[in-house]
């Protein structure tokens, strides 16, 4: 009962986590214009992994996609890759874990197979969560570095006459969503791995022992009791490899220079 609960809870937690990772990846607010100690502007800038947006005080919002692959910072490309790998692994993990759920009966699937699948999905969730946390953390580090760089030259004077304000960016909502979602996926994966131990069939059978009482010839043959000794020799861990995910910006828009964080 506890095993089923742990497995079910692990699945639900991972499902929420992966939904969060997907949401974070799609969100535009990875970095937002820093409003603290800044000249108050009637324009608010924020940026995501795929496009940058500007919201005017009037309410008008304009977003422009990064319609270039080679022109983007390597760090941004790395963050995109980490998030996509996290989503792909998580999605496959969810698919595997559905069939591994103890409460779902599929033909004559043995408990050992379910245990294997539970462990596989658990590992996938752990890696997925780590990818998301790593992606968000890399982006956050990039923001912090650029924040202090732009603070150092907050106002860049032009001939001592004109001042140009440099927009500083700080952590956006997507970063927090990503961290929480990555953490949940990680926790869900650990729960699946714990549930796997309980699902594993007990393999060791005790041999029948004959006891000879004096004068009588009575044989006691206990049945094949199973002891919990972890994984049996027939348990194989399946490895699922990600064939690599590729995204392309499909809609063409007017080109623009993007001051990326």
């Amino acid at each position: 009962m506890a095993v089923t609960a742990c497995q079910g809870l692990g699945f639900v937690v991972s499902l929420i986590g992966i939904a969060g990772i997907i949401a974070a990846t799609c969100m535009d607010q990875w970095s937002t214009q820093d409003l603290y100690n800044n000249p108050v502007t009637a324009v608010f800038n924020y940026q995501g992994l795929w496009r940058s947006c500007v919201r005017e005080s009037s309410g008008f919002t304009e977003c422009r996609g990064y319609f270039t692959l080679l022109g983007l910072p390597a760090m941004l490309q790395a963050v995109r890759a980490l998030m996509i790998v996290g989503i792909v692994l998580g999605a496959i993990g969810l698919l595997v874990s559905i069939f591994a759920l103890k409460c779902i009966r599929i033909g004559s699937m043995e408990d050992s197979a379910k245990a294997n699948m539970t462990l596989t999905s658990g590992i996938m969730f752990i890696v997925s969560g780590l990818c998301a946390i790593a992606g968000v953390s890399v982006f956050a580090n990039m923001l912090v570095t650029n924040f202090w760089m732009s603070t150092a030259n907050m106002y860049t004077g032009m001939g001592g006459m004109v001042q140009t304000v440099q927009t500083r960016y700080t952590f956006g909502a997507a970063l927090f969503v990503g961290w929480v979602a990555g953490g949940l996926t990680l926790i869900g994966g650990v729960m699946m791995c714990i549930a796997c131990r309980g699902l594993a069939p007990e393999e060791t059978n005790y041999k029948a022992v004959s006891y000879h009482a004096s004068g009588h010839s009575v044989a006691y043959k206990p049945g094949g009791f199973k002891a919990s000794t972890g994984f049996g020799s027939n348990t194989k861990n399946k490895k699922i490899y990600d064939g690599g995910a590729r995204t392309e910006d499909e809609v063409q828009s007017y080109p623009s220079k993007h001051d990326y964080v």
């Epitope: 000249p39 009637a42 324009v43 800038n45 005080s57 008008f60 304009e62 140009t164 220079k257």
Partner: antibody, heavy 117, light 113 residues
């Protein structure tokens, strides 16, 4: 079409307060912001403040302490209240709908306010 | 506050002539996020409220004749009237729409010779 109709007193005594109402039609206050601008006779334009679609406001820091802008979405009305008026507050007061680029796309006809004893 | 400096303060022209007026801001009005300049031009005729001509420094408001052209970026902006008509005689104001408070220039008065 978009219209902004202003109503308010023409004459205000010094140290008294001013209240002007801007009634809009042809657009919703839940979608657009409204700004207030004034123009002293024979002089240039001065932005007073604005109330945005979400209800948040921004004011000219020089007038912030005596200025208040609020709105009633259901009645399509925006209200400007200014306290402690002095003779140099004599001006034509305009309300305007805010459009693209935070520009003032449509203007009211204006309310001439004279501060005099 | 951002200071908007317009020049000349007045301009005497003849009908059909090409006119340019300048507007300079004390800080750049270019937003790096969308590469738009938050500068607006208005036309005000005597006894009338101002009328929007150009926003985002160069985008003409619908219904505005194409003889009006806005240009410039950062801190230096220009309004050009390719062929002045009698109905164009008015005061032209530029406005900072980027920093609060939203400030106006003192205006350029266009008069007929």
């Amino acid at each position: 079409q978009v219209q902004l109709q202003q109503s308010g007193p023409g004459l205000v005594a010094p140290s008294q307060s001013l209240s002007i109402t801007c009634t809009v039609s042809g657009f919703s206050l839940t979608n657009y912001g409204v700004s207030w601008i004034r123009q002293p006779p024979g002089k240039g334009l001065e932005w007073l403040g604005a109330i945005w679609a979400g209800g948040n406001t921004n004011y000219n820091s020089a007038l912030m302490s005596r200025l208040s802008i609020r709105k009633d979405n259901s009645k399509s009305q925006v209200f400007l209240k200014m306290n402690s008026l002095q003779t140099d507050d004599t001006a034509m007061y305009y309300c305007a709908r805010v459009g693209y680029g935070n520009s003032f796309a449509n203007w009211g006809q204006g309310t001439l306010v004279t501060v005099s004893a | 506050d951002i200071v908007m400096t317009q020049s000349p303060s007045s301009l005497t022209v003849t009908a059909g002539e090409k006119v340019t007026m300048s507007c300079k801001s004390s800080q750049s009005l270019l937003n790096s996020g969308n590469l738009r300049n938050y500068l607006t031009w208005y036309q005000q005729k005597p006894g009338r409220p101002p009328k929007l001509l150009i926003y985002w420094a160069s985008t003409r408001e619908s219904g505005v004749p194409d003889r009006f052209t806005g240009s410039g970026s950062g801190t230096d902006f220009t309004l050009t009237i390719s062929s002045v008509q009698a109905e164009d005689l008015a005061v032209y104001y530029c406005q900072n729409n980027y920093f609060y408070p939203l400030t106006f220039g003192a205006g350029t008065k266009l008069e007929l010779k």
